[in-house]
């Protein structure tokens, strides 16, 4: 009996036309939602004038349906048993699952001012930028609608820059009508233990963002893993959102709609400093902000964001060192709400439920040549927003799963 089940599973998880896995892989049958909480700055003037702590108040959720589009340009390569594809991006606002509208206003860091002062450290260039910032009546903080902040707006300061720069700014700009990839993954035909594991991303086996092994593209995209998952495994996956590969470890057994699943979580060790976890040494790319690589819980992904000083963390700086959050008031990290987990059905390796949580922050530094940043006395890693992307297998699919997979085994 077990051999027959193994044989069936091996056949059905292969990523090729006609299998159960392929149908669900092309276009997920699970509804995926991305909830955003925006950090509304309560004291912009005091920060700018006195270098006070930034007082934030999170507002949300603002919910979007995401990943509803089928994979595109799916191409099988029988020579190396891979399948390549693009993952199109799309987001549809869900008013009934949100606390307000996309027109809601927020006081947030001026993304362009913070980024420009970082990208152009040349003091004379900063003098030029200062004149343009003043001319455009821009400041350290700005008021933007949710739609503008997430999906993009034309920045008045950047519009005055005589040098060819993109004048549109947004935390996820551009998003709609774009695609992630090309991904090339193993289809599992020759070896089921490699199914869904990424061979190349954008035509390369490395990212070119990090040194050494940190730069590797490891594992799958976390939507599924090779079958017959063991609790002792360390599940590697690549997330283009955070520009790196990361891993999850077994935490507990969970019953999901009658299906036994393994809950894998991202451990705090994955966010540790090289002092605590030497394996992370190559994720520390600079010495000043990281306090000689002793800070933890934030990842500088500026190299992956055209030099913009973007830092990724867990929401509310969960698992981050005290020095990171000491300049921010109003944060309440909570493991249950703010960690990332994957609920994996171990026989098939399918992720049947997940919650991906991350926070996007921007570094802003004092600049004696830019008036609106001149009175700052310290660096700030400013939280802009955090997101919770979730998906849970639907009731019908769960029923099918119980009858065709777990039921047969039990």
């Amino acid at each position: 009996g077990d051999m027959l089940i193994q044989k069936t599973i091996k056949k059905e998880v292969v990523l090729e036309e006609g299998t159960i896995a392929f149908k669900n892989w092309v276009k997920t049958g699970t509804e995926i939602y991305r909830q955003f909480w925006i950090f509304d700055v309560q004291n912009p003037q005091e920060v700018m004038m006195n270098s006070s702590n930034i007082q934030v108040k999170q507002r949300g959720p603002y919910t979007y349906r995401v990943r509803f589009l089928a994979k595109e340009n799916i191409t099988q390569d029988p020579k190396d048993n891979t399948v390549s594809f693009l993952q199109p991006n799309g987001a549809i606002f869900e008013p009934s699952l949100s606390v307000g509208t996309e027109a809601d206003n927020f006081t947030v860091l001026n993304l362009a001012v913070a980024a420009a002062s970082h990208i152009y450290p040349n003091p004379f260039v900063q003098v030029v930028l200062n004149s343009l910032i003043n001319k455009s009546k821009s400041s350290m903080f700005q008021v933007r609608t949710l739609r503008e902040l997430l999906w993009g707006y034309t920045d008045p300061f950047l519009s005055l820059v005589p040098y060819p720069v993109s004048t549109r700014v947004g935390m996820f700009y551009p998003y709609n009508n774009t695609a992630d990839g090309v991904y090339k993954v193993f289809n599992g035909k020759d070896s089921i233990s490699k199914v869904a594991i990424i061979d190349t991303y954008k035509g390369k086996r490395n990212l070119s963002y990090w040194e050494s092994y940190c730069d590797m593209i490891n594992g799958t995209d976390a939507a599924s893993f090779p079958p017959f998952v063991e609790k002792s495994q360390v599940l590697q996956f690549f997330s283009s959102d955070i520009c790196r590969s990361i891993y999850a470890v077994f935490e507990s057994d969970v019953n999901l709609k009658g299906i036994p699943v393994y809950r894998f979580v991202l451990p705090s060790k994955a966010f540790a400093s090289p002092v605590q976890n030497p394996d992370n040494h190559c994720f520390c790319t600079e010495k000043i902000i990281s306090k000689n690589c002793t800070s933890y819980g934030v990842l500088d992904i500026s190299k992956c964001k055209e030099g913009k000083p973007v830092y990724i963390s867990l929401p509310h700086f969960l698992y981050a060192s005290p020095d990171v959050s000491e300049t921010i008031d109003g944060l309440n990290p909570n493991e249950e709400e703010h960690r990332t987990y994957l609920d994996i059905e171990p026989i098939t390796g399918f992720t049947l439920q997940f919650a991906k949580r991350l926070q996007v922050n921007l570094l802003v530094k004092p600049s004696n040549k830019i008036q609106v940043l001149k009175r700052l006395k310290r660096n700030y890693i400013v939280p802009i927003l955090w997101l919770n992307e979730t998906g849970t297998i639907g009731d019908e699919k769960a029923k099918m799963f119980r009858s065709q997979v777990t039921g047969k085994i039990n």
């Epitope: 152009y120 040349n122 003091p123 004379f124 260039v125 003098v127 030029v128 930028l129 200062n130 004149s131 003043n134 005589p162 040098y163 004696n368 040549k369 008036q371 001149k374």
Partner: antibody
Framework: AVTLDESGGGLQTPGRALSLVCKAS????????MFWVRQAPGKGLEWVAG????????LYGAAVKGRATISRDNGQSTVRLQLNNLRAEDTGTYYC???????????WGHGTEVIVSS | ALTQPSSVSANPGETVKITCSGG???YGWYQQKSPGSAPVTVI????KRPSDIPSRFSGSASGSTATFTITGVQAEDEAVYYC???????????FGAGTTLTVL
């Protein structure tokens, strides 16, 4: 030694255009911002224009804004100041200067004299 | 423009201090020995001295005020000294009107 040599001055007619060139040597020209500073007879120093190390960003003093263009050729180690619609008050000695990297001059040229007169 | 005294005088060997205010940061001090002669940088970036400038010349800055000091002034130091910096309310670099140093 750092050397900055200006040329292109002389007697000019009001309303016409002027082109001053500064030839640099003795340092890695492409690593420095460059400025033009002028001094009217019997007066103090006045900042005219600046350009960043790769020529992307420029800035002009209020008196010449809209009439001046500063440009550079890193291959030739030269910086140029084009000044249009000359006026009598543009008369003076024009100095090429090197920015130390913090909008603070650390080297000057010998200057080229410009006289605007009909 | 930056504000500096129009003139100061001192006996040889004395210490001379010239202040400059109104700029935002990174001051420089420029010596001009005669009208029409090229200025010479004696201090740049507040306190840095070019290698060919004697150690009696020094500079410092605190807040929006810079101070230029000649410790043990000599006859050949007689000149006009201009401070230069960046004025945040103005787009670009600015200079003071110059301080004439007379060595008695």
């Amino acid at each position: 030694a750092v050397t900055l040599d200006e040329s292109g001055g002389g007697l000019q007619t009001p309303g016409r255009a002027l082109s001053l060139v500064c030839k640099a040597s003795g340092f890695t020209f492409s690593s420095y911002n460059m400025f033009w500073v002028r001094q009217a007879p019997g007066k103090g120093l006045e900042w005219v224009a600046g350009i960043d190390d790769d020529g992307s960003f420029t800035l002009y003093g209020a008196a010449v804004k809209g009439r001046a263009t500063i440009s550079r050729d890193n291959g030739q180690s030269t910086v140029r100041l084009q000044l249009n619609n000359l006026r009598a008050e543009d008369t003076g000695t024009y100095y090429c200067a090197r920015d130390s990297g913090a909008v603070s001059i650390d080297a000057w040229g010998h200057g080229t004299e410009v006289i605007v007169s009909s | 423009a930056l504000t500096q005294p129009s003139s100061v005088s001192a006996n040889p060997g004395e210490t001379v201090k010239i202040t400059c205010s109104g700029g935002d940061s990174d001051y420089g001090w420029y010596q001009q020995k005669s009208p029409g002669s090229a200025p010479v940088t004696v201090i740049y970036q507040n306190d840095k001295r070019p290698s060919d400038i004697p150690s009696r010349f020094s500079g410092s800055a605190s807040g929006s005020t810079a101070t230029f000091t000649i410790t043990g002034v000599q006859a050949e130091d007689e000149a006009v000294y201009y401070c230069g910096g960046w004025d945040g309310s103005y787009d670009g670099a600015v200079f003071g009107a110059g301080t004439t140093l007379t060595v008695l």
